[in-house]
């Protein structure tokens, strides 16, 4: 494994004031799956409701990089290649669980964390409100 | 915290043999305070390539439900209601973590394991392939 | 199969706490969460809160913070829930639950909490 | 809170009815919605999940319906152990459930 060394200022697990913690094996199972979703399919471009993948990076999180999908455009795209506003592109997105160290920049001490990202982009159809 | 009787057969953290392990404070912290994923929407209907969400359950992890997207149709949802086969519905996937008790029953020792899940669907232009 | 079985009935007085115990027999309570979920006499069911055991991590309805507390023992597999300054409206069937953190599939039988004078 | 309201707060029908409740939410909960069903004494049983999902073990006569706001819970044709109280719950946010729809005998 590897060893790093204690930061005076980390906590220690033998504190019994620390809240609930255990010890997490980070050797990953199933290491082998592609993390940029770039390279594993192209359908952010060829989607009706296209998408641009922005890389979020934070050292203080595990994985310090995540994919976020923004879709390029409010509408979706038609058989002409041209936006169509009658329909909307809009995100899919996933609540998923990431590693945040806490204290900061402890390297052996973390936190659960849930958050949301986008992960690409579908087409509906708009939700008409009508005005009595 | 919550202090648990060490069960003999569990890891020991100070073993140099035990893979890269780190401290984990389990108090998950939620920072999707606003933005419920779970209210978020009813796309999975009113895409253009819809689909139905599938439950994946596993009692030894966790999450221990998480929903799996499959696309409806081959082709995507037309201005008409109807299955336009010139398009195609494909799902869009997310590598997340989840975490396992290892080994099994174990209380304060986990590995974190990636898994792909289907999040949603899309609709794509065909890659058409051309015989020479 | 999961079962959950949960401690017998209480009289308590006003301004008293209560303790209730739910059991997972049949396993462990492997990464659910346990919710309470609570009926008065005649009424519908209220959700309580939860807990995760594998995490300990809680969350409670905005209705009971600070009045309830949800605990449990991963070594006996049994999940607590504690109500305290107890009024009469709160004379109800306190049940545990399974639960997936989407939908309640297992629940105890049920423990009648009554708060008398 | 997420507001849940059932209709009708009863309902009188016969052994082989079709049998239709209804739950609307006071904003989208997209399809988390679940379906319970209790007899006096005893502790509520999980019947439909996610809106439309049968759970194991329940008779196929028990269907559910709808997304964002306006779910149905159906029985085909009532048997004489469905005479109960069935409550919708939403698991969008915190769990919250309907005020309860009791199926008498007519």
């Known amino acids: 494994g590897i060893t790093i060394p204690r930061n005076p200022g980390c906590p220690n697990s033998e504190d019994k004031n620390f809240p609930r913690t255990v010890m997490v094996n980070l050797n990953i199972h199933n290491r082998n799956t592609n993390t940029n979703p770039k390279r594993s399919s192209d359908y952010y471009n060829r989607s009706t409701s296209p998408w641009n993948l922005h890389r979020n990076e934070d050292p203080e999180r595990y994985p310090s990089v995540i994919w976020e999908a923004q879709c390029r455009h409010l509408g979706c795209i038609n058989a002409d290649g041209n936006v169509d506003y009658h329909m909307n592109s809009v995100p899919i997105q996933q609540e998923i669980l990431v590693l945040r160290r806490e204290p900061p920049h402890c390297p052996n001490s973390f936190r659960l964390e849930k958050i949301l990202v986008s992960v690409g982009c579908t087409c509906v159809t708009p939700i008409v409100h009508h005005v009595q | 915290g919550i202090t648990i009787p060490r069960n003999p057969g569990c890891p020991n953290s100070e073993d140099k043999n035990f893979p890269r392990t780190v401290m984990v404070n389990l108090n998950i912290h939620n920072r999707n305070t606003n933005t419920n994923p779970k209210r978020s929407s009813d796309y999975y209907n009113r895409s253009t390539s819809p689909w139905n969400l599938h439950r994946n359950e596993d009692p030894e992890r966790y999450p221990s439900v998480i929903w799996e997207a499959q696309c409806r149709h081959l082709g995507c949802i037309n201005a008409d209601g109807n299955v336009d086969y010139h398009m195609n519905s494909v799902p869009i996937q997310q590598e997340i973590l989840v975490l396992r008790r290892e080994p099994p029953h174990c209380p304060n020792s986990f590995r974190l394991e990636k898994i792909l899940v289907s999040v949603g669907c899309t609709c794509v232009t065909p890659i058409v392939h051309h015989v020479q | 199969q999961v079962q959950l079985v949960q401690s017998g009935a209480e009289v308590k007085k006003p301004g008293s706490s209560v303790k209730v115990s739910c059991k997972a027999s049949g396993g462990t309570f492997s990464s659910y969460a346990i919710s309470w979920v609570r009926q008065a006499p005649g009424q519908g069911l209220e959700w309580m809160g939860s807990?995760?055991?594998?995490?300990?991590?809680?969350n409670y309805a905005q209705k009971f913070q600070g009045r309830v507390t949800i605990t449990a023992d991963e070594s006996t597999s049994t999940a607590y829930m504690e109500l305290s300054s107890l009024r009469s409206e709160d004379t109800a069937v306190y049940y545990c639950a399974r639960d997936s953190e989407y939908y309640f599939d297992h629940w105890g039988q049920g423990t009648l909490v009554t708060v008398s004078s | 809170d997420i507001q849940m309201t059932q209709s009708p707060s009863s309902v009188s029908a016969s052994v082989g009815d079709r049998v239709t409740i209804t739950c609307r939410a006071s904003q989208g909960i997209s399809n988390w919605l679940n379906w319970y069903q209790q007899k006096p004494g005893k502790a509520p049983k999980l019947l439909i999940y996610?809106?439309?999902s049968l759970q194991s073990g329940v008779p196929s006569r028990f269907s559910g319906s709808g997304s964002g706001t306006d779910f149905t819970l159906t029985i085909s044709s009532l048997q004489p152990e469905d005479f109960a109280t069935y409550y919708c719950?939403?698991?969008?946010?915190?769990?919250?459930f309907g005020q309860g729809t009791k199926v008498e005998i007519k």
């Open positions: 719950q939403q698991y969008s946010d915190d769990p919250t």
């Open positions: 807990i995760i055991p594998w995490f300990g991590t809680t």
């Open positions: 996610a809106a439309s």
